[in-house]
Amino acid sequence: AMHVAQPAVVLASSRGIASFVCEYASPGKATEVRVTVLRQADSQVTEVCAATYMMGNELTFLDDSICTGTSSGNQVNLTIQGLRAMDTGLYICKVELMYPPPYYLGIGNGTQIYVIDPEPCPDSDF
């Protein structure tokens, strides 16, 4: 299996944005790569977003995706937005080297993303 590295812990910003790097040790010269972010919480795994990209090109997520990203060599910079406290969980980076064959699959150990909802502003008396 291909090795995938990602940070153990990331704290989302007060605006609910979390960014982390997903790095893979490519055993071959892939031209087409698929990156998938999975969220594991309470032993349930769900797909957060996925993108396929050509090496050297930008990642293209679906228009309604909460993810954006850029790639550089064997590194993918992933940003997840719109996070709330309830989205706290383990976010796993899955990398697939699709073409040319052979196919390689690597799954990271996950990044624990902590999301803290901002305190509401107290009402002002005028």
Epitope: M98, Y99, P100, P102
Partner: antibody, heavy 118, light 107 residues
Framework: EVQLVESGGGLVKPGGSLRLSCAAS????????MAWVRQAPGKGLEWVSF????????YYADTETGRFTISRDNAKNSLYLQMNSLRAEDTAVYYC???????????WGQGTTVTVSS | DIQMTQSPSSLSASVGDRVTITCRAS??????LNWYQQKPGKVPKLLIY???RLHSGVPSRFSGSGSGTDFTLTISSLQPEDVATYYC?????????FGGGTKVEIK
């Protein structure tokens, strides 16, 4: 039900051109790579070309590189093979096939016959 | 290119017989070995992928085995409807290549 229907074959003179089409239905076309495979009369199967689901990756057999062009239109659920500079040895039944992992062709069309002869 | 060599090129067996077809790759293809069946005058159909996994709708009398460079397709009990040419195909490296085929007939 997965369905692949090829069209565009016919008789063409050496050096001529043809454009094959493959209409796909019964599955999400944009999720799958697609391939063309041919079979000369009385012979075995020969892989011709492949295009990935989003058309990022395109590959050809050595003998077809520069003469054949594979393309797809995901909005129309269609696959194409533009064949130029055709030779007698290109005479075959051309099959369009769906190709998922593990680089296997899991569903095939009924084929369209290409005959290159003067 | 990876060469795929099938043997025998043809065979004749009786209904109920166990039939074995072998496929040898010119180099290690890991588990990227697929088998196809083509009945006379018909379209090829995927039988087995990843060496041993049956494609949907394929009868359980078909099985695949092997590793590395040597692979086998077995029909445990030959049926009249199994008359066909069987092809192996490697997906490990481009160009994808097929074996020359094994024609199976009923005695």
């Amino acid at each position: 039900e997965v369905q692949l229907v090829e069209s565009g074959g016919g008789l063409v003179k050496p050096g001529g051109s043809l454009r094959l089409s493959c209409a796909a239905s019964g599955f999400t076309f944009s999720d799958y790579g697609m391939a063309w495979v041919r079979q000369a009369p009385g012979k075995g199967l020969e892989w011709v070309s492949f295009i990935s689901n989003l058309a990022y990756s395109v590959y050809y057999a050595d003998t077809e590189t520069g003469r054949f062009t594979i393309s797809r239109d995901n909005a129309k659920n269609s696959l194409y093979l533009q064949m130029n500079s055709l030779r007698a040895e290109d005479t075959a039944v051309y099959y369009c096939a769906r190709s998922g992992l593990p680089y296997a062709m899991d569903y095939w069309g009924q084929g369209t016959t290409v005959t290159v002869s003067s | 290119d990876i060469q795929m060599t099938q043997s025998p090129s043809s065979l004749s067996a009786s209904v109920g017989d166990r039939v074995t077809i072998t496929c040898r790759a010119s180099q290690d293809i890991s588990n990227y070995l697929n088998w196809y069946q083509q009945k006379p005058g018909k379209v090829p159909k995927l039988l087995i992928y990843y060496i041993s996994r049956l494609h949907s709708g394929v009868p359980s009398r078909f099985s695949g085995s092997g590793s590395g460079t040597d692979f086998t397709l077995t029909i445990s009990s030959l049926q009249p409807e199994d008359v066909a040419t069987y092809y192996c195909q490697q997906g490990r490296m481009l160009p994808w290549t097929f074996g020359g085929g094994t024609k199976v007939e009923i005695k």
